[in-house]
């Protein structure tokens, strides 16, 4: 008889994903000496560890401890670009300034950018039919949590000026319940970080308009300075300009001396 | 190391035209905005005139906006300015600029400017 | 378009810090750029992104940017600062704008 299988509202685990982590892992610990240490299958164990016979609804923090302990890596605390809701461009810009660092430039944020998965309670199996979609089902998801640990640890280890990149295309170019908003911002340690400076990036080449006045712009800035923060923002009108190197990075030009 | 050569100024008459070109040298062209900007003589600096990687997107200040085109030829790593219906307050040296890279829109690096004057 | 005010000359004995404004409304929401440019050549880029040097400026040049002002300071002037300065900034579209300048002499 075929055993009953929870539904969930969500895409399943990404196909592939343990080759997927493992071959990233490779990848990344060939590129960055400073993480050569590091064993590839303790790290997919680890991972595998944090959400395997698991109910996908029940995944706490603590789930990730291993894995977090695994992937522990030291980025300059004062190059840190947080972002919301345009993380391509955001890549797109640390491809070109190497020396500033998004979540997903370090081992642990590489090896799951774009990747989902979960397991299911009580069997040893990956759930490729579907997994819990954060507002339907729930938040306590493997993917949800992976990404509020890491972002949280993240954001913990800034100093500083911290920039973060964000949508002014968007209707909420802040928006509170995003990561950055729901984590990232709570987590920055005013002991530690000086200033949070916004990038506010215009979508449309025409665009004047000065989106550092916008209220939810306004609702950022009262929140990070209530926790004795100075905010800066800056209105950044042509990305098209973050291309200028991608295509060239080789150019001396393009790197963050000028 | 880079550099920006500036040609094509002169004595032009009222009304006249006059094309300026800026050779470029010392970095990848096509991977950077490019500029013009003028200074009257003994006043300010002037933006007139800005140009995409691809040369898809112009931006022309007021002063010049329909009588000024910018133009540049990526495999020639030349920058253009076509200068048509010339006033007396067209009188400048205008130099070629190149953007800095990413977030930052200024001008890093600057030719010596070619000088354009304009009188009957 | 916002408008960038400086004044027109500045002063200051050698060795003394020396310091420029430019004004715009919100200035702070934009990055300035600064120039330096002596008679007969070309401006060079002192300043860029508020605060930035790029490499080859000395050390005495520094700038900040908050409120409605943007300040080019030099520390410890020197007989060879004596310039014309201009600030510069971008608020999109065709709107990239210079200060009318400001002539600094060195006593």
């Known amino acids: 008889v075929p055993r009953w299988r929870q539904q969930w509202s969500g895409p399943g685990t990404t196909k592939r994903f343990p080759e997927t982590v493992l071959a990233r892992c490779v990848k990344y610990t060939e590129i960055h000496p400073e993480m050569r240490h590091v064993d590839c299958q303790s790290v997919w164990d680890a991972f595998k560890g944090a959400f395997i016979s698991k109910h996908p609804c029940n995944i706490t923090e603590e789930d990730y401890q291993p894995l977090m302990k695994l992937g522990t890596q030291t980025v300059p605390c004062n190059k840190i670009l947080l972002w919301s809701r345009i993380k391509d461009l955001a890549h797109q810009f640390t491809q070109v300034q190497r020396d500033m660092f998004t979540l997903e430039d370090t081992l642990l944020g590489y090896l799951a950018d774009d990747l989902t998965w979960c397991g299911e309670f009580n069997t040893s199996k990956i759930n490729y039919q579907s997994c819990p979609d954060w507002r339907k089902d729930c938040s306590n998801n493997p993917v949800s949590v992976f990404w509020k640990t890491v972002s949280r640890r993240f954001a913990e280890a800034a100093c500083d000026v911290v920039h973060v990149m964000l949508n002014g295309s968007r209707s909420k170019i802040f928006d509170k319940n995003s990561t950055f908003g729901s984590v990232e911002v709570h987590n920055l340690q005013p002991e530690k970080v000086q200033t949070l400076e916004a990038w506010v990036i215009h979508g449309g080449r025409e665009d004047s308009r000065d989106l550092c006045q916008d209220p939810t712009i306004k609702e950022l800035e009262s929140i990070i300075s209530k926790r004795n923060i100075q905010f800066s923002c800056k209105n950044i009108y042509r990305p098209d300009k973050f291309l200028q190197c991608v295509k060239n990075p080789e150019d001396s030009s393009c790197t963050s001396e000028i | 190391q880079v550099q920006l050569v500036e040609s094509g100024g002169g004595l032009v008459q009222p009304g006249g035209s006059l094309r300026l070109s800026c050779a470029a040298s010392?970095?990848?062209?096509?991977?950077?905005?490019m500029n013009w900007v003028r200074q009257a003589p003994g006043k300010g600096l002037e933006w007139v005139s800005a140009?995409?990687?691809?040369?898809?997107?112009?931006y022309y200040a007021d002063s010049v906006k329909g009588r000024f085109t910018i133009s540049r030829d990526n495999s020639k790593n030349t920058l253009y300015l076509q200068m048509n219906s010339l006033r007396a307050e067209d009188t400048a040296v205008y130099y070629c600029?190149?953007?800095?890279?990413?977030?930052?829109?200024?001008?890093?690096?600057w030719g010596q400017g070619t000088l354009v004057t304009v009188s009957s | 378009d916002i408008e960038l005010t400086q004044p027109p000359s500045v002063s200051v004995a050698p060795g003394q810090t020396a310091r420029i404004s430019c004004s715009g409304d919100?200035?702070?929401?934009?990055?300035v750029y600064w120039y330096q440019q002596k008679p007969g050549q070309a401006p060079v880029l002192v300043i860029y992104?508020?605060?930035k040097r790029p490499s080859g400026i000395p050390e005495r040049f520094s700038g900040s940017n908050s409120g409605n002002t943007a300040t080019l300071t030099i520390s410890g002037t020197q007989a060879e600062d004596e310039a014309d300065y201009y600030c510069?900034?971008?608020?999109?579209?065709?709107?990239?704008?210079f200060g009318g300048g400001t002539k600094l002499t060195v006593l």
């Open positions: 140009i995409s990687m691809d040369g898809v997107y112009k």
């Open positions: 919100n200035l702070r929401h934009y990055y």
């Open positions: 510069q900034t971008y608020t999109g579209g065709a709107s990239l704008v």
């Open positions: 010392g970095f990848t062209f096509s991977s950077y905005y």
């Open positions: 992104g508020d605060s």
């Open positions: 600029a190149r953007d800095l890279p990413l977030v930052y829109t200024g001008f890093a690096y």
